[in-house]
């Protein structure tokens, strides 16, 4: 299923990444889909 609004799929974690948590670390590969 696609990720919910405000989140993005992370191939590194095999789960949806909450983009709000990426604001503090935009340079993490986990956050690539939130850029």
């Amino acid at each position: 299923a696609p990720c919910s609004r405000g989140s993005s799929w992370s191939a590194d974690l095999d789960k949806c990444m909450d983009c709000a948590s990426c604001a503090a670390r935009p340079h993490s590969d986990f956050c690539l889909g939130c850029a």
Epitope: A11, R25, S28, F30
Partner: antibody
Framework: EVQLLESGGGLVQPGGSLRLSCAAS????????MIWVRQAPGKGLEWVSY????????HYADSVKGRFTISRDNSKNTLYLQMNSLRAEDTAVYYC?????????????WGQGTLVTVSS | DIQMTQSPSSLSASVGDRVTITCRAS??????LNWYQQKPGKAPKLLIY???SLQSGVPSRFSGSGSGTDFTLTISSLQPEDFATYYC??????????FGQGTKVEIK
């Protein structure tokens, strides 16, 4: 009880190969990212490689890229590190560790380590 | 790459002393900083995660603070079992993580 048990270390000549294993028990292995970290004799900790829970995504330190391959078999609860073209500077204790937290922010369980010695 | 620099590299202290170890990042890492303890011949053990959260089972004499580039690990009253090497580690650039060079706490 969570346990990670490394094996496969030993003495190998420069240019040789080794395959390290890390057997996991006491937890459900498949949802967790895993890493390898090494420690040269008398030195600090160096991250080596990362693998996603499914094994579909991998990352490597520049020092081992193109020579080492990380993989996992979730059906066997085992993590691997294939080490090729070994160099003297690869001599170290190799640890596997489990990524903790929702977003892999720390490593909450470590194996006891296996020693790799590269020497002629 | 983000470099992590610990100070001091080693220190001598007595049982009961308050000990402070500093970790400085070469750029801001927000609060993505963890601390580990390692005893000779043993694997590292997680003490503090996300700068200030105490890992389950770790004694409350250990505490962490800081944000941005400067972080501190404090042992409020050093115990005999605390003599070890301590490492900081940043996860800001996960999965590409880096460790500090370590701080060895020795008996005075």
């Amino acid at each position: 009880e969570v346990q990670l048990l490394e094996s496969g270390g030993g003495l190998v000549q420069p240019g040789g190969s080794l395959r390290l294993s890390c057997a996991a028990s006491g937890f459900t292995f498949s949802p967790y990212p895993m890493i390898w970290v090494r420690q040269a004799p008398g030195k600090g900790l160096e991250w080596v490689s990362y693998i996603s829970p499914s094994g579909g995504s991998t990352h490597y330190a520049d020092s081992v890229k193109g020579r080492f391959t990380i993989s996992r078999d979730n059906s066997k609860n085992t993590l691997y590190l294939q080490m090729n073209s070994l160099r003297a500077e690869d001599t170290a204790v190799y640890y596997c560790a489990r990524g903790g937290d929702t977003y892999f922010d720390y490593f909450d369980y470590w194996g006891q380590g296996t020693l790799v010695t590269v020497s002629s | 790459d983000i470099q992590m620099t610990q100070s001091p590299s080693s220190l001598s202290a007595s049982v009961g002393d308050r000990v402070t170890i500093t970790c400085r990042a070469s750029q801001s890492i927000s609060g993505y900083l963890n601390w580990y303890q390692q005893k000779p011949g043993k694997a590292p053990k997680l003490l503090i995660y996300q700068a200030s959260s105490l890992q389950s089972g770790v004694p409350s004499r250990f505490s962490g603070s800081g944000s941005g580039t400067d972080f501190t690990l404090t042992i409020s009253s050093l115990q005999p079992e605390d003599f070890a090497t301590y490492y900081c580690q940043q996860s800001y650039t996960s999965p590409f993580i880096t460790f500090g060079q370590g701080t060895k706490v020795e008996i005075k």
